[in-house]
């Protein structure tokens, strides 16, 4: 058993049918010695008396808020949560496996640049009685500071019969140098509590691997005289690291017809302009990627050909 | 990216071209190592990230762009020098700061070259003959060193009398390639910045 926060304790259980469970001793936080009784949650049934209460925790019915009283007055509370270990592996009931970029990906994180700021998000089908708390650091043995905000509900989607809820959190490395070569990964730890179930999820990454630039901005077309060709120009996104000559991007320019089946013409360039043939009813899209370290491409910025 | 790519201007200073070749070569070599050594811990998540140049060179700090000198987090630890202008030493006069940056890059390349050559000698003794270093990568390191045009003492190739542990050697190869790829990215960024200065 360990303390998650003041008066909240996590009991780790080897989870299988008929498991013996864990013996837990609760102590009433009071100078009083006699006349103390114990109850669980809203029930008035007295579970025991005395300054300590010994319980065998096996199932969720044994978890909850234990309260010690004296003469009708509440003395202290202890909330017991359960953390299930199923055949040597901690349970992952609360969050959905996003399966991207690989199986067992519960937390996904992205950064728009090398400033040390990143966003992580996760999915669940649970709508109520759910709390998250997020901690992060650079490295784990001698951790350096990363500050995370509160996790917030960022999107709701309907997936088949189920509603899916997306939560996200923003974190910032306390002292980040955009040009630094990372040798220790960022560690992100999310504590999730649903009713009386506790779970924790972790992700470990280098900022360089989670970079996804914003789409190029100010995408414009300039028709070339007496030609079906147009000059496409764009700019680096505002959120990208500076100077741009050091943090350079490469770009992919795509001409896409109205029909998804039509052949796409693609050109790759390091410049912020390109000359392409603009077909009728087509659209021109541009996306960006770090020129030197191939992490994710940005989303597309698009303009119609007409 | 096996699709049309707009080619750089021919007037571009020589080191940029060499540094781009270097990054391409080390990335290809790393990819090959990860595929060939699929039963070894060779992914970024599995290896220890070691930097053989740590405490010997200070490329990141010495080559820091002027714009980042205001960022205190970039100025921690060592004495730092900043790039102001310039290009490859052979092509025009270079400031003192600039020389520090480029000589630091040169020292990095020299250190990695020695490590890779020593490692290749061990890998050639492996009866499995599973993986060897790409000669193209070694050649590209050499070309960039020549373009940087520094004269420094030659570091003797390390020779080892004991029987090599091929498993450990292959894991060390993965560690070296990951670290060298990260350094090659920094070198490319620096050269791109210098080219624009």
């Amino acid at each position: 058993i360990w303390e998650l926060k003041k008066d909240v304790y996590v009991v780790e259980l080897d989870w299988y049918p008929d498991a013996p469970g864990e013996m837990v001793v609760l102590t009433c936080d009071t100078p009083e010695e006699d006349g103390i009784t114990w109850t669980l949650d809203q029930s008035s049934e007295v579970l025991g008396s005395g300054k300590t209460l010994t319980i065998q925790v096996k199932e969720f019915g044994d978890a909850g808020q234990y309260t010690c009283h004296k003469g009708g007055e509440v003395l202290s509370h202890s909330l017991l949560l359960l953390h299930k270990k199923e055949d040597g592996i901690w349970s992952t009931d609360i969050l959905k496996d996003q399966k991207e970029p690989k199986n067992k990906t519960f937390l996904r994180c992205e950064a728009k640049n090398y400033s040390g700021r990143f966003t992580c998000w996760w999915l669940t089908t649970i709508s109520t009685d759910l709390t998250f708390s997020v901690k992060s650091s650079r490295g784990s043995s001698d951790p350096q500071g990363v500050t995370c905000g509160a996790a917030t509900l960022s999107a709701e989607r309907v997936r088949g019969d189920n509603k899916e809820y997306e939560y996200s959190v923003e974190c910032q490395e306390d002292s980040a140098c955009p040009a630094a070569e990372e040798s220790l990964p960022i560690e992100v730890m999310v504590d999730a509590v649903h009713k009386l179930k506790y779970e924790n999820y972790t992700s470990s990454f280098f900022i360089r691997d989670i970079i996804k630039p914003d789409p190029p901005k100010n995408l414009q077309l300039k028709p070339l005289k007496n030609s079906r060709q147009v000059e496409v120009s764009w700019e680096y996104p505002d959120t990208w690291s500076t100077p741009h000559s050091y943090f350079s991007l490469t770009f992919c320019v795509q001409v896409q017809g109205k029909s998804k089946r039509e052949k796409k013409d693609r050109v790759f360039t390091d410049k912020t302009s390109a000359t392409v043939i603009c077909r009728k009813n087509a659209s021109i899209s541009v996306r960006a990627q770090d020129r030197y370290y191939s992490s994710s491409w940005s989303e597309w910025a698009s303009v119609p050909c007409s | 990216r096996n699709l049309p790519v707009a080619t750089p201007d021919p007037g571009m200073f020589p080191c940029l071209h060499h540094s781009q070749n270097l990054l391409r070569a080390v990335s290809n070599m790393l990819q090959k190592a990860r595929q060939t050594l699929e039963f070894y811990p060779c992914t970024s998540e599995e290896i220890d990230h070691e930097d053989i140049t740590k405490d010997k060179t200070s490329t990141v700090e010495a080559c820091l762009p002027l714009e980042l000198t205001k960022n205190e987090s970039c100025l921690n630890s060592r004495e730092t020098s900043f790039i102001t202008n310039g290009s490859c030493l052979a092509s025009r006069k270079t400031s003192f700061m600039m020389a520090l940056c480029l000589s630091s890059i040169y020292e990095d390349l020299k250190m990695y070259q020695v490590e890779f050559k020593t490692m290749n000698a061990k890998l050639l003794m492996d009866p499995k003959r599973q993986i060897f270093l790409d000669q193209n990568m070694l050649a590209v390191i050499d070309e960039l060193m020549q373009a940087l045009n520094f004269n420094s003492e030659t570091v003797p190739q390390k020779s080892s009398l004991e029987e090599p542990d091929f498993y450990k050697t292959k894991i060390k190869l993965c560690i070296l390639l990951h670290a060298f790829r990260i350094r090659a990215v920094t070198i490319d960024r620096v050269m791109s910045y210098l080219n624009a200065s």
């Epitope: 049918p17 055949d87 199986n103 | -």
Partner: antibody
């Protein structure tokens, strides 16, 4: 004590369907994940499918994906395996089993797919 | 499509020490725990070892499990006639958990 009693096995023609049941007692069935495992005559153990405690997630072996469906009725304390488009290679003893470091197995039920 | 490899058979005389190996990879035995089962003819498998080296109550102490790197092994110290059975190792794979990965199985024969 924990008990898993299986039923539903038998002889069936290729292409036909069969449903296996596994009735649980002696524990809170709705709290635990459950597996189906099979063993072809004279062969080793092969995992078939898994279902989470609340039925929210189901996982299948590639060899049965799209043909077999694992389900559970927590109000009846029963686990099911619906098998469709049966093939000769599905002939095996099928076992249900609890998920956990200590597990309990059903007695097994024989499924024979033969014309 | 077994990923965990066991020797098809091992044998020993009563009282001898018999070991069965189970070889896997980094994504299964290398990063997950291992179980061992005993299966007597015509019966369901019986758990012998869980968590690499833990014995459930009721399992004789002549059975012991161990794991090193990407391999695990089961040892029967002082093998007895009633130990003649099939033995299976079981683990998980990081990417496909909770799918069970079983070993190919080993037939233990007690001679004499």
């Amino acid at each position: 004590q924990v008990q898993l009693v299986q039923s539903g096995g038998g002889v069936v023609q290729p292409g036909r369907s069969l449903r296996l049941s596994c009735a649980a007692s002696g524990f809170t069935f709705s709290s635990y994940g459950m597996h189906w495992v099979r063993q072809a005559p004279g062969k080793g153990l092969e995992w078939v499918a898994f279902i989470r405690y609340d039925g929210s997630n189901k996982y299948y072996a590639d060899s049965v994906k799209g043909r077999f469906t694992i389900s559970r009725d927590n109000s009846k304390n029963t686990l099911y395996l619906q098998m469709k488009s049966l093939r000769a290679e599905d002939t095996a003893v099928y076992y249900c089993k609890t998920h956990g470091s200590h597990d309990n197995w059903g007695q097994g039920t024989m499924v024979t797919v033969s014309s | 499509s077994y990923v965990l490899t066991q020797p098809p058979s091992v044998s020993g005389t009563p009282g001898q020490r018999v070991t069965i190996s189970c070889s896997g990879g980094r994504s299964n035995i290398g990063s997950k725990t291992v179980k061992w089962y005993q299966q007597l003819p015509g019966t369901a498998p019986k758990l012998l070892i869980y968590g690499n080296d833990q014995r459930p109550s009721g399992v004789p102490d002549r059975f012991s499990g161990s794991k090193s790197g990407t391999s695990a092994s089961l040892a029967i110290t002082g093998v007895q006639a009633e130990d003649e059975a099939d033995y299976y190792c079981q683990s998980y794979d990081r990417g496909t958990h909770p799918a069970l990965l079983f070993g190919t199985g080993t037939k233990v024969t007690v001679l004499g």
